[in-house]
């Protein structure tokens, strides 16, 4: 008996073939010999069936012996035998429905588990296989889960279920409400203006929740919070905001904030957490701050970096279209008696410059 | 909702090949066939072919000796290929779904043959 | 093939006005015809279909009869969304037919 898979709420086609190339008369029954369809002359007849509003079947084809039974919108309760009888034979074809679909909503926040429910009928004793869109492989039977979701879980999920070495491929939507970055970092030279952005992973027809961006200064002793916004529908509004520094933020997404200057006060890292409405848990993106300054009083040349900085990082003064440079591994080096000319402080990353800073020394006489 | 997006080169020369793909979202293409129609002032509407799921091909036999439907069952897309088109094969060229009748259709894709 | 001719080719009428639009085939197809309506710039849209079913958010105003070679669509009272084109098709075998349409004007 030849087994067919079908897709809940999809459409399949049980085909019924005549070894004749031509209109012939033939019927369709279930398990219980109740009648689905027929033909009666040219007709298509329904019979007392459960599915006869959803089976149908392709006239054009008869003419080549073709008698397939369309079944519309599946249930898994038509899983069941069916029987095509045509020619005084009977093909018996039978027909598993499943289902797969996602415990809780398909829109999740980053950590959160998933579960994945597979609906099927009785009797059957399916494996279920998913991968993810970056290539994760999960198997499992009736439940598959997913402990925690990471950003490139987001995508569409394809899921195979296996029954009689015949299969079934499902497609599940999955979009992990996350920040792009997990962590990002600004660096800036004293007094210049410092811009944070936070873009979305995702999008949201309606994105409304409330956030909040705590930041703990270097040189402080205890982090706080420095602005307070709503989201509603995609629009940002501010609803509290510390007096130094006195920040900015963007009215429309992606979140974004401005401090009008990069002071070594500042230097430091954030944590903007984003709760949206009608989920549990909330979106989180650190941001670090890294401020440089290069001073010169009397016959010391002096640059320093605040903020949070890797140990690898080099920093280096360093005379132009001169050799004379100094460098350290360190957050601050300084050159006595320096020479004229103009100088360049370098903050640098095995040789890429992540911020550098001017500084003039003029001749003393 | 099932609804189909179609897409394709506009203008040809006579004696090219026209590509056109067309992508089912909102459902499956299991079950049912897939078919392309085409409409022109001078012929009015007619059907140019069909495919399935499985690549089960049926064809209008006046233009079969030039037609090539296909099927992406991974994308969720069938396209048609129409080989050595003349200024006759000027039409609007519609994707759509057929049990035995059409529905729903794509919005149309416009493509002239011309020198 | 199957030829399937539409009449008349064009009608004018009024808002309000019962119109009845005919098709005929050249071979008994039974009930295995359709009727699609299509406006200026748009794909068809299928109305009726099985001679007489009609297709799920079609106004009740359409109505579809006939079985054999000869069928007719009606419209009961006419709206002003119901003036465009109207084709017959056929499902009977293939290839699949279509009339070649019935222009219907504003009077």
């Known amino acids: 008996k030849k087994v067919v898979l079908g897709k809940k709420g999809d459409t399949v086609e049980l085909t019924c073939n005549a070894s004749q190339k031509k209109n012939t008369q033939f019927h369709w029954k279930n398990s219980n010999q109740i009648k689905i369809l027929g033909i009666q002359g040219l007709f298509l007849t329904k019979g007392p069936s459960k599915l006869s509003d959803r089976a149908d079947s392709r006239k054009s084809l008869w003419d080549q012996g073709c008698f397939s039974m369309i079944i519309k919108n599946l249930k898994i309760e038509d899983s069941d035998t069916y029987i095509c009888e045509v020619e005084n034979k009977k093909e018996e074809v039978e027909l598993l429905v499943f289902g797969l679909t996602a415990n809780s909503d398909t829109h999740l926040l980053e950590g959160q588990s998933l579960t994945l429910t597979l609906e099927s009928p009785p009797g059957s004793s399916p494996s279920v296989k998913c991968r993810s869109p970056g290539g994760k492989n999960i198997q499992g039977g009736r439940t598959i889960s997913v402990p925690q979701l990471e950003r490139q879980d987001s995508g569409t999920w394809t899921c195979t279920v296996s029954q009689d070495q015949k299969t079934v491929e499902f497609k599940i939507d999955i979009v992990v409400l996350a920040f792009q970055k997990a962590s990002s970092t600004v660096y800036k030279k004293e007094g210049e203006q410092v811009e944070f952005s936070f873009p979305l992973a995702f999008t949201l027809e309606k994105l409304t929740g409330s956030g909040e961006l705590w930041w703990q200064a270097e040189r402080a002793s205890s982090s706080k919070s420095w602005i307070t916004f709503d989201l509603k529908n995609k629009e940002v509004s501010v609803k509290r905001v510390t007096q130094d520094p006195k920040l900015q933020m963007g009215k429309k997404l992606p979140l974004h904030l401005t401090l009008p200057q990069a002071l070594p006060q500042y230097a430091g890292s954030g944590n903007l957490t984003l709760a949206l409405e009608a989920k549990t848990g909330k979106l989180h993106q650190e941001v670090n701050l890294v401020v440089m300054r290069a001073t010169q009083f009397q016959e010391n040349l002096t640059c320093e970096v605040w903020g949070p900085t890797s140990p690898k990082l080099t920093l280096s003064l360093k005379l132009e279209n001169k050799g004379a440079t100094v460098s350290k591994q360190a957050k601050a080096v300084w050159v006595l008696n320096p020479e004229a000319g103009m100088w360049q402080c370098l903050l640098s990353d095995s040789g890429q410059v992540l911020l550098e800073s001017n500084i003039k020394v003029v001749p003393t006489w | 909702q099932v609804q189909l997006q179609q897409w394709g080169a506009g203008l040809l020369k006579p004696s090219e090949t026209l590509s056109l793909t067309c992508a089912v979202y909102g459902g499956s293409l299991s079950g049912y066939y897939w078919s392309w129609i085409r409409q022109s002032p001078g012929k009015g509407l007619e059907w140019i072919g069909e495919i399935n799921q499985s690549g089960s091909t049926n064809y209008n036999p006046s233009l079969k000796s030039r037609v090539t439907i296909s099927v992406d069952t991974s994308k969720d897309q069938f396209s048609l290929r129409l080989t050595s088109v003349t200024a006759a094969d000027t039409a609007v060229y519609y994707c759509?779904?057929?049990?035995?009748?059409?529905?729903?259709w794509g919005r149309g894709t416009l493509v002239t043959v011309s020198s | 093939d199957i030829q399937m001719t539409q009449s008349p080719s064009s009608v004018s009428a009024s808002v309000g006005d019962r119109v009845t639009l005919t098709c005929r085939a050249s071979?008994?197809?039974?009930?295995?015809l359709a009727w699609y309506q299509q406006k200026p710039g748009k794909a068809p849209k299928l109305l009726i279909y099985?001679?007489?079913s009609l297709q799920s958010g079609v106004p009740s105003r359409f109505s579809g009869s006939g079985s054999g070679t000869d069928f007719t669509l009606t419209i009961s009272s006419l709206q002003t969304e119901d003036f465009a084109t109207y084709y017959c098709?056929?499902?009977?075998?293939?290839?699949?037919?279509f009339g070649q349409g019935t222009k219907l004007e504003i009077k």
């Open positions: 099985a001679a007489s």
């Open positions: 098709q056929q499902a009977n075998s293939f290839p699949y037919t």
């Open positions: 759509t779904r057929v049990l035995n009748w059409f529905d729903p």
């Open positions: 071979q008994d197809i039974s009930n295995w």
